[in-house]
């Protein structure tokens, strides 16, 4: 499944939210929508 990140400090991995430390800007991919900074 897709993996992508939110700039509020968590990422979706295997369709669940888990916390991570770094932030990723929206220049790293397409905006997913209806999230906080989710890009893929």
């Amino acid at each position: 499944d897709a993996e992508f990140r939110h700039d509020s400090g968590y990422e979706v991995h295997h369709q669940k939210l888990v916390f991570f430390a770094e932030d990723v800007g929206s220049n790293k991919g397409a905006i997913i929508g209806l999230m906080v900074g989710g890009v893929v």
Partner: antibody, heavy 121, light 111 residues
Framework: QVQLVQSGAEVKKPGASVKVSCKAS????????IHWVRQAPGQGLEWMGF????????NYNQKFKGRVTMTRDTSTSTVYMELSSLRSEDTAVYYC??????????????WGQGTLVTVSS | DIVMTQSPDSLAVSLGERATINCRAS??????????LNWYQQKPGQPPKLLIY???KQGTGVPDRFSGSGSGTDFTLTISSLQAEDVAVYYC?????????FGGGTKVEIK
């Protein structure tokens, strides 16, 4: 202005495949994922998945896994949703959509006009 | 998967009166103090339109009579003074986790 324009209605036999297109304009194509949502006649909304025009990565609703494929063509700013092994229950209007992320200000959504896919023998 | 349940299925309200629609999630749709809960309006023959996002925030161009409340698993959409153009089906949706899921919809009619 942002526009998502979908391909026309389709009639398919059970077991066949259908490929619906969604052509984006009015913004930089690679900056927003495109989602697909379907609606059976008189029924509610069902999220099918999305694809990223930036990376080509897709995320599918497990309900459709193995039957749905979402792709993009960056040269024409078009996203495709192909559904295979069609059955009568797949008769629905299929929408493509684009959403903003939650910001501090506002969120906009943009939808295609919908494509009716009828599965009938 | 998160299951979204709406009530009632349909609602008849007099013009100018308040309409209230409820939505319950099978598990919390909150994360980092944000509720990933959205409301849509769909009129016949049209695609859905985002009314409310993050449980309480109004979408672009949405009239002030539409408001959302709630957190965790229980949410409410309120139309403070029903207008004729508000006749539609309303859906809640969670975007906390994939697969995104919608409630079954609530049809709002004029009494």
């Amino acid at each position: 202005q942002v526009q998502l324009v979908q391909s026309g209605a389709e009639v398919k036999k059970p077991g066949a495949s259908v490929k619906v297109s969604c052509k984006a304009s009015g913004y930089t194509f690679t900056t927003y994922a495109i989602h697909w949502v379907r609606q059976a006649p008189g029924q509610g909304l069902e999220w099918m998945g999305f694809t990223s025009p930036y990376s080509g990565v897709s995320n599918y609703n497990q309900k459709f896994k193995g039957r749905v494929t979402m792709t993009r063509d960056t040269s024409t700013s078009t996203v495709y949703m192909e559904l295979s092994s069609l059955r009568s229950e797949d008769t629905a209007v299929y929408y493509c959509a684009r959403f903003d992320n939650y910001p501090r200000g506002y969120v906009r959504d943009y939808w295609g006009q919908g494509t009716l896919v009828t599965v009938s023998s | 998967d998160i299951v979204m349940t709406q009530s009632p299925d349909s609602l008849a309200v007099s013009l100018g009166e308040r309409a209230t629609i409820n939505c319950r999630a099978s598990e919390s749709v909150d994360n980092d103090r944000i509720s990933f809960l959205n409301w849509y309006q769909q009129k016949p023959g049209q695609p859905p339109k985002l009314l409310i996002y993050a449980a309480t925030k109004q979408g672009t161009g949405v009239p002030d009579r539409f408001s959302g409340s709630g957190s965790g698993t229980d949410f409410t959409l309120t139309i403070s003074s029903l207008q004729a153009e508000d006749v539609a089906v309303y859906y809640c949706q969670q975007s906390k986790e994939f697969p995104w899921s919608f409630g079954g919809g609530t049809k709002v009619e004029i009494k």
